[in-house]
Interface confidence: medium
């Protein structure tokens, strides 16, 4: 499955929007820094089947969508930027869903890659727990925004590697 050219453009726009969501200087939040244990191994170039990579990418973007579409995120971040971000992620998810069905087929389920998907879900659970513990403070959101920028960049790199393998 070839992800369309618009997909990588959308990825770039999503990253720019994440950068624009910064409300405070990261330097004022150094005491709030946290290691969320990003599941790096799921994004490394281990002989990934393409279908598995796409399923993991989909989960990553879906969880990002879920994280930023809460009432708490709307209160902490710019509403219009958030909405633009949702729309970009929606288009990314649509592209990946089409690909999952071409690569995996309707019979096989992405549950085949449950371990990888579970690792991504647990990563986002740690982020959500952190936000809850920090009572969704502006510094907590800044730490999370920076973390998502980093993990989103890594997932974009995986997509680039998939494209170069075609």
């Amino acid at each position: 499955c070839d992800l369309p050219q618009t997909h990588s453009l959308g990825n770039r726009r999503a990253l720019i929007l994440l950068a624009q969501m910064r409300r405070i200087s990261p330097f004022s939040c150094l005491k709030d820094r946290h290691d969320f244990e990003f599941p790096q191994e799921e994004f490394d170039d281990k002989q990934f089947q393409k279908a598995q990579a796409i399923s993991v990418l989909h989960e990553m973007i879906q969880q990002t969508f879920n994280l930023f579409s809460t009432k708490d995120s709307s209160a902490a971040l710019d509403e219009t930027l958030l909405d633009e971000f949702y729309i970009e992620l929606d288009q990314q998810l649509n592209d990946l869903e089409s690909c999952v069905m071409q690569e995996v087929g309707v019979i096989e389920s992405p549950l085949m890659y449950e371990d990888s998907i579970l690792a991504v879900r647990k990563y986002f659970q740690r982020i959500t727990l952190y936000l809850t513990e920090k009572k969704y403070s502006s510094c907590a959101w800044e730490v999370v925004r920076a973390e998502i920028m980093r993990s989103f960049s890594l997932s974009i790199n995986l997509q680039k590697r998939l494209k170069s393998k075609e």
Epitope: F65, S69, D83, Y86, I87, D90, N94, E97, M101, V104
Partner: antibody, heavy 118, light 109 residues
Amino acid sequence: QVQLKQSGPGLVQPSQSLSITCTVSGISLTSYGVHWIRQSPGKGLEWLGVIWSGGNTDYNAAFISRLSTTKDNSKSQFFFKMNSLQAKDTAIYYCARGRGNYVPFTYWGQGTLVTVSA
Amino acid sequence: QIVLTQSPTIMSASLGERVTMTCTASSSVSSTYLHWYQQKPGSSPKLLIYSTSNLASGVPARFSGSGSGTSYSLTISNMEAEDAATYYCHQYHRSPPMTFGGGTKLEIK
């Protein structure tokens, strides 16, 4: 590809109700809302309502008294019911999938042409 | 509710010609929430451009969108036969109802 398949009657008697089913197929990896939109020669595209993944609904105020939408998650089926149809309700009725409540529609049903006539 | 007025209602263009159609909102709409669809006879609408200027998957680069506030436009830089269709603008922002424009029918001259 994700597909939305609609089924429902082509002809409805005046004052009777219209029921349409929208079945979503393909791997559905996410939660989403299903919107209902109609297209009539006189009024163009008109949004009627939506049922969200959690089951809550929003309706166009002009139709709220005679419209209901429900779903069966286990069958990936979404149900649309409109009461008291009149000739002016003759239109093509579409279901469409939206992920958030302000994202555009990438996936649409094929449409159900409904004629209200005795 | 926000009313979207499209103009012209019907237009014709020669192959290779540059085509522009407009969508005017009765009150200001953020560019994030303004989308365009293409519909051919007997088919469902197809997402063409989202958030004013972003091309949906698989849409040729000859299509572009622009605008802000109450005035938006869709341009085809180089009309092709397959572009003959009706084009609708669409807005939605959180509170229902979403609305669509009346459409611009584009024919081949």
